[in-house]
């Protein structure tokens, strides 16, 4: 798969493949994988990709299911790249406070916060 | 501060305190703090709280600015708790796939994805 494919298109294609291959992926009825119990997905990327690794090792490869796991590995690459960008730029305190304010604003409006 | 205060209320109060104390916090003109260069904030919680730590060590404590840093420390506690919940429950593959689908769906619709 060319890595030049835009990440947004990659995500869309992966969603479709995930749906198509659901019964193949759940063929191992006894396998158990850690599943986060909240919806703040970005906090759990490490565990999600560990789970994907477990699933891949238990899944017969070939055809488009192989493409699914390739896509997921490219998505992981993208996310790892984003994580690297978390600490790359050293800026003035004003700019850090702006980011902190945005972060708390997002927490305030978009996070699913349990009591 | 009683930890019983709901996290949502804590976040709101912290946003207000951040605004109130902005000039005090930016008093150190030479200080530089790593600032993420993208808006997928949840990926950068570690760096954000490291930055808060740097800022706290450089800020004269007392009064409500102390309350601001206490709040931020409680928010960190909440996020650390959420991160712990990423891998607590081992479930069937079906449920892992549901979570993965939600995660990709959120990436598809809510993430700011650069080409």
């Amino acid at each position: 798969i060319p890595t030049e494919i835009p990440t947004s298109a990659l995500v869309k294609e992966t969603l479709a493949l995930l749906s198509t291959h659901r019964t193949l992926l759940i063929a191992n009825e006894t396998l158990r994988i850690p599943v986060p119990v909240h919806k703040n997905h970005q906090l759990c990327t490490e565990e999600i990709f560990q789970g994907i690794g477990t699933l891949e090792s238990q899944t017969v490869q070939g055809g488009t299911v192989e493409r699914l796991f390739k896509n997921l590995s490219l998505i992981k690459k993208y996310i790892d790249g984003q994580k690297k960008k978390c600490g790359e730029e050293r800026r003035r305190v004003n700019q850090f406070l702006d980011y902190l304010q945005e972060f708390l604003g997002v927490m305030n409006t978009e996070w699913i916060i349990e009591s | 501060i009683p930890t019983e205060i709901p996290t949502s209320a804590l976040v709101k109060e912290t946003l207000a305190l951040l605004s109130t104390h902005r000039t005090l916090l930016i008093a150190n003109e030479t200080l530089r703090i790593p600032v993420p260069v993208h808006k997928n904030h949840q990926l950068c919680t570690e760096e954000i709280f490291q930055g808060i730590g740097t800022l706290e060590s450089q800020t004269v404590q007392g009064g409500t600015v102390e309350r601001l840093f206490k709040n931020l420390s409680l928010i960190k506690k909440y996020i650390d708790g959420q991160k712990k919940k990423c891998g607590e429950e081992r479930r069937r593959v079906n449920q892992f796939l549901d979570y993965l689908q939600e995660f990709l769906g959120v990436m598809n619709t809510e993430w700011i994805i650069e080409s």
């Epitope: 019964t23 193949l24 063929a27 191992n28 009825e29 | 449920q95 796939l97 549901d98 689908q101």
Partner: antibody
């Protein structure tokens, strides 16, 4: 159009077995799980288990584990549910239902097969 | 196994009224709750999946909410065809279980 068509009503003696079929059409049979749910007269719904048509793997409700067998024939897009050692309290309408995928809701149902167990 | 308790057992309402049906789980099941409608002599029909998502072809007057142990199905304005039995169902834990049903009848 998705359709699940079940076999006709059955009358069985206690101790006998019954095999109900469920023919799927309008979608790719191997891409969705098939569940079996029963409903005794005037009662609520009871989940019996499911079969994965792709792999043939099954997950059964512990209550039925020793008596139920779910199979499928992918060549004719049909799932089967066999219940053995029938008792009078197995008298019920037996439904097959397709699993909708994400979060596993039962999105399409067969018309039901009435199984009467009586001596 | 997770026990689902539906209340009330019977709900007597007139067309146009709002119906609120409750389903309580004996233990937390995140949002793995689905709702079905069943009319006499018919198979159940999926209305709401994963607590709050409207199933395909279902009118927008049906809505679901809740998470954890408490869930609600709401019919904003009852139509004559809505008088039926409603079941909640969980699939967070095996075995999957259904509630005992709530009958919505014409007052």
């Amino acid at each position: 159009e998705v359709q699940l068509v079940q076999s006709g009503a059955e009358v069985k003696k206690p101790g006998a077995s019954v095999k109900v079929s469920c023919k799927a059409s309008g979608y790719t049979f191997t891409e969705y799980l098939i569940h079996w749910v029963r409903q005794a007269p005037g009662q609520g719904l009871e989940w019996m288990g499911y079969i994965n048509p792709y792999s043939g793997g099954t997950v059964y409700n512990e209550k039925f584990k020793s008596r139920v067998t779910m199979t499928r024939d992918t060549s004719i897009s049909t799932a089967y549910m066999e219940l053995s050692r029938l008792r009078s309290d197995d008298t019920a309408v037996y439904y097959c239902a397709r699993d909708g995928g994400y979060s596993d809701p039962l999105d399409y149902w067969g018309q039901g097969t009435m199984v009467t167990v009586s001596s | 196994e997770i026990v689902l308790t539906q209340s009330p057992a019977t709900l007597s309402l007139s067309p146009g009224e709002r119906a609120t049906l409750s389903c309580r789980a004996s233990e937390g099941l995140t949002s793995y709750m689905h709702w079905y409608q069943q009319k006499p002599g018919q198979a159940p029909r999926l209305l709401i999946y994963k607590a709050s998502n409207l199933a395909s072809g279902i009118p927008a007057r049906f809505s679901g909410s809740g998470s954890g142990t408490d869930f609600t199905l709401t019919i904003s304005s009852l139509e004559p065809e809505d008088f039926a039995v409603y079941y909640c169902q969980q699939n967070w834990n095996d075995p999957w279980t259904f509630g005992g049903g709530t009958k919505v009848e014409i007052k």
